[in-house]
């Protein structure tokens, strides 16, 4: 059986590790190209060298391969607050991250935005800010947590969930008012 030419994984499995099956001759296994290089020409025959060329500037391959083109280097997204941690090399893509005291929020698997870590004003740090998670705050009495910020209970409306957290505070205020009238 001749493997499907479109099914790269099945074709590779016919050859030993580190080799791939010649696209025009399934009796020949060619050596894969090292990371940092790409396939320029398939090996002409068994035991003969594959013609691999180094990736050009702005492109890379991070593992052994038989790609016809190197992959384009990623660019860090300024509009998302990203900064370059390490620049692209022929065998490694750009590494993007966030500044100090910021964390990554992933909107999707391959898209993140940098946000400032919460300072927990009017509260205490329950869990410190991590690379991919904001600080977790615990609020002082008289404050409730809203979108990871400690907000005064005076901003708590009856319809909001904060009523449970602010209830003792509200009752205290009522109690003070009642005792003042006698």
């Amino acid at each position: 059986l001749v493997p499907h030419l479109g099914d790269r994984e099945k074709r590779d499995s016919v050859c030993p590790q580190g080799k791939y099956i010649h696209p025009q001759n399934n009796s020949i296994c060619c050596t894969k190209c090292h990371k940092g290089t790409y396939l320029y020409n398939d090996c002409p025959g068994p035991g003969q060298d594959t013609d691999c060329r180094e990736c050009e500037s702005g492109s890379f391959t991070a593992s052994e391969n038989h790609l016809r083109h190197c992959l384009s280097c990623s660019k860090c997204r300024k509009e998302m607050g990203q900064v370059e941690i390490s620049s692209c090399t022929v065998d490694r893509d750009t590494v993007c991250g966030c500044r100090k005291n910021q964390y990554r929020h992933y909107w999707s698997e391959n898209l993140f935005q940098c946000f400032n870590c919460s300072l927990c004003l009017n509260g205490t740090v329950h869990l410190s800010c991590q690379e991919k998670q904001n600080t977790v705050c615990t609020c002082h009495a008289g404050f409730f947590l809203r979108e990871n910020e400690c907000v005064s209970c005076s901003n708590c409306k009856k319809s909001l969930e904060c009523t449970k957290l602010c209830l003792p505070q509200i009752e205290n205020v009522k109690g003070t008012e009642d005792s003042g009238t006698t």
Epitope: R77, K78, E79, M80, W107, Q113, F115, N134, E147
Partner: nanobody
């Protein structure tokens, strides 16, 4: 008051095209990166595409790459999404939004426009 008003949705056959618009007011449009997000029936919000302030840098979700094009006209305070080669799985309510700055939540987004892809 910030206002974002989407339009251009409708019923379209698979393989068809639509162009969504988002008219912005109440803020300096040219100063804000903008986002298109969508919500398919019974699903969560999905980031579709975004564009920087000047329209130079763009991003597309893998599911729409090569089919959708985001653009903006700062002189008209309008954001666009050109949708080609539409598929049934593109059926959703599409929202435009200002890229969040303070935290991972959308403080400003529109009421949405429904796109239905069906034969």
């Amino acid at each position: 008051e910030v206002q974002l008003l989407e339009s251009g949705g409708g019923l379209v056959q698979p393989g068809g095209s639509l162009r969504l618009s988002c008219a912005a007011s109440g803020f300096t449009f040219a100063h804000e990166p903008m986002v298109w997000i969508r919500q398919a029936p019974g699903k969560g919000l999905e980031w579709v595409s975004h564009i920087d302030r000047v329209g130079q840098d763009t991003y597309y979700a893998d599911s729409v790459k090569g089919r959708f094009t985001i653009s903006r006209d700062n002189s008209k305070n309008t954001l666009y999404l050109q949708m080609n080669s539409l598929r049934a799985e593109d059926t959703a309510v599409y929202y435009c939004a200002i890229l969040p700055k303070r935290g991972p939540r959308f403080d400003y987004w529109g009421q949405g426009t429904l796109v239905t892809v069906s034969s």
